[in-house]
């Protein structure tokens, strides 16, 4: 049987080494074990009595079905337990009683059908993040389940298999700042939501079909929400479920953000929010973002007329892969206080954009991201938005554009350009001598010579360039990035004649360790002040000798540097 | 209805070994915990060892430790106490018990941990 292996601050790891029991030559000195993935099976009274100065204990995926009564009586300073994923088919409080310096347990991925007999917390006053539940056993909240708790960071339930849900069950945890609720069904969603209205401050739901979801209203008193922020993740929907889950907003007046991943609409986007004050509710919500979301009718999906009054006030949003090849005129106009627009991974043409992008449309917008879409011209692209007037931030990187011209035309106040990995292999003035920050990495380029009198950020990481770019073209330049490219020196005339950099990145370049270049890294500590990740990332490709050492280690032979 | 039997004490010199055997019939014990306890004349019942179903994870009592071994047979649903370098203060009756239900809220070093519980063996260390 294989050991643990421990370093010197008592972190100790065994896991996947094929432990059947709880290894013995445990010691105070250890602060974290970790035994996961083993076939543990059984924890029993004296198996970590040695451990009294344990602070992470780790058994997570180790066949434990059995753990007696007071087998962690003397985890007294223990402050994270993972049981997760084991074969735990009841929970007894009894293990938990000793464990009053607890901060983070999961008790998650165990057959269990309920929490146990009694309360298994009241003693965990200090926890700060509790996961529990199961995909297909875990079918019964109760009252008494979350007694003595009375604040959480992050409380996570699993109850896909929900068939029972008793009213006020999480009411008793007066603050939750972010609760993950994994239901498959809808059924006790209202009942959950007017207990938590008063506590959660992020609500987040995982893998619910709504699609019958019928808002009716909520038995609670004027509550004062602290809910700033409302996810659904892997939920299905209707244009019908859609409106119904509007009507929940009427109850979370702070509401400031909600998010959409990896759902499915079964619908048209045939949105009727049927409440005209559901409208001034949204007033709040400042961002919306929406990633993956599958419409499997997406050809027939509407314009989305019925719901851009509900936008009006919104200043970020994001869509995500989800096939969008257009956004109507109408609806960017009405985006009134849009700020940023991501449209990464979609669909977008230069022909569509132009619509998207028409007079008067988002008239606040500073930052427009479109990358990995199907743009070609960057020509093209720059006289499209030039509509936007306060636009300021353009990111268009992975489109595949075809070389560039001589000359381009850009909104006037751009100052951030990302062109990364769009195959570019020339740079030409096309680019807007305006810019502040330009990003060209993961490119073709060999050479850049293109004078950016504003310019403070160049990153042309992932390039095939030999030399550094020459310092007369970016006489303001603070921070550089040209790793991974094929510069083989740098020497003190070049770096000092960057007046203003503070940070050069550099590294896994082709070094060539020459007299010169080991003398200037030996003479100079302050290199370490500016290069990034110096000493490590910077060694010598040749001489042959010297391969593979760091610059700051290679010493030169005195036979080559005093001929 | 569960019964286990004890067998294999006896009278032992100092310094002897002593192997217990404790056969538990009707039930099946493929789940069960099984314990050895010892209680010298006028002391209290006091806990030796115990081992798990699949023999995975064992315990000694501070009495036990470096000088007694506990295993067990599966198949033939036996559990064993090897006893070596055996002295005066070990002179006891050694009682074997089983422990069938699946839920552990309490400790295996308590007698109110298990089920069921055999007569007894008699284990004599002569000086």
């Known amino acids: 049987q294989e050991s643990l292996s421990c370093d010197a601050s008592g972190v100790c790891d065994g896991r996947s080494r094929s432990f059947t029991s709880i290894p013995s030559g445990l010691t105070a000195a250890m602060k974290s074990l970790d035994l996961s993935f083993n076939k543990i099976t059984y924890i029993g009274h004296g198996d970590l009595r040695a451990c009294a100065n344990l602070q992470v204990l780790i058994l997570k995926s180790s066949r434990i079905n059995t753990i007696e009564g007071d087998a962690f009586y003397s985890l007294g300073s223990l402050e994270h337990l993972d049981l997760s994923d084991n074969h735990l088919s009841s929970l007894s409080s009894s293990w938990f009683g000793p464990l009053s310096s607890l901060k983070y347990l999961n008790l998650m991925g165990n057959p269990y059908q309920t929490l146990g007999v009694t309360s298994l917390f009241p003693n965990l006053t200090n926890l700060q993040t509790l996961r529990i539940g199961n995909v297909e056993t875990f079918s019964e909240i109760r009252r008494i389940d979350f007694a003595g708790l009375t604040s959480l960071n992050e409380l996570e339930i699993k109850a896909l298999s929900l068939r029972n849900y008793q009213s006020q069950s999480l009411k008793s945890i007066r603050d939750i700042h972010h609760l993950t609720l994994h239901l498959s069904e809808s059924a006790f969603l209202l009942e959950i939501f007017a207990d938590i209205l008063s506590s959660v401050r992020y609500l987040e739901l995982r893998d619910t079909n709504l699609a019958r979801f019928q808002f009716s209203p909520l038995p609670v008193d004027e509550v004062s929400s602290p809910m700033k922020k409302l996810a659904f993740r892997g939920s299905v929907l209707t244009d019908e479920s859609f409106n119904e889950l509007l009507k929940l907003l009427r109850y979370i007046l702070e509401l400031s953000e909600v998010e959409f991943d990896d759902c499915t609409l079964n619908g048209l986007g045939d949105f009727n929010p049927s409440e005209s004050d559901v409208v001034s509710e949204l007033g709040k919500v400042e961002t919306v973002t929406i990633r993956r979301l599958h419409i499997p009718q997406f050809y027939l999906f509407y314009d989305l007329s019925t719901v851009y009054s509900l936008l009006e006030k919104v200043k970020r949003i994001t869509v995500e892969n989800s096939k969008v090849f257009l956004v109507p005129c109408s609806f960017s106009q009405h985006l009134k206080s849009l700020e940023f627009l991501d449209l990464s991974e979609n669909l977008m043409v230069e022909e569509y954009l132009k619509n998207s992008a028409c007079k008067g449309a988002w008239p606040s917008l500073q930052t427009l991201v479109l990358s990995q879409n199907h743009l070609r011209s960057m020509q093209k692209t720059g006289e499209i938005l030039l509509t936007l007037k306060n636009l300021t931030s353009l990111d268009i990187s992975r489109n595949t554009f075809h070389p560039m011209p001589d000359s381009c035309q850009w909104p006037e106040k751009m100052r951030f350009l990302n062109l990364s990995s769009t195959g570019i292999r020339v740079v030409k003035t096309c680019i807007p001598q305006t810019l502040e920050v330009l990003d060209v990495s993961n490119n073709n380029l060999d050479s850049f010579s293109l004078f950016l009198p504003r310019l403070q950020e160049l990153y042309i990481s992932r390039n095939k360039l030999k030399t550094l770019p020459d310092a007369s073209l970016f006489p303001v330049l603070l921070v550089m990035k040209i790793r991974e490219n094929a510069v083989s020196t740098f020497s003190k005339d070049q770096l000092g004649s960057f007046p203003k950099l503070e940070t050069l990145e550099a590294g896994d370049n082709h070094f060539v360790c020459s007299c010169e270049l080991l003398s200037f890294t030996m003479e100079t500590p302050a290199l370490a002040q500016i290069l990034v990740d110096w000493p490590d990332s910077y060694l010598c490709d040749s001489p042959p000798r010297l391969h593979g050492h760091r610059l700051q280690d290679a010493r030169p032979s005195v036979l080559e540097c005093h001929q | 209805e569960v019964q286990l039997v004890e067998s294999g004490g006896g009278l032992v010199q100092t310094g002897g070994s002593l192997r217990l055997s404790c056969a538990a019939s009707g039930s099946t014990f493929s789940k069960a915990v099984m314990g050895w306890f010892r209680q010298a004349p006028g002391k209290e019942r006091e806990f030796v060892a115990r081992?798990?179903?699949?023999?995975?994870?064992?315990y000694y009592g501070d009495s036990a430790k470096g000088r007694f071994t506990i295993s067990r047979d599966i198949g033939k649903t036996t559990a064993y106490l090897l006893m070596n370098s055996l002295q005066p203060e070990d002179t006891a009756n050694y009682f074997c018990?089983?422990?069938?239900?699946?839920?552990?809220?309490?400790?295996?070093?308590?007698?109110?941990?298990?089920?069921?519980w055999g007569q007894g063996t008699q284990v004599t260390v002569s000086s």
């Open positions: 018990a089983a422990r069938m239900r699946p839920v552990f809220s309490s400790s295996s070093v308590q007698e109110s941990f298990y089920d069921y």
């Open positions: 081992i798990t179903w699949n023999g995975g994870s064992t």
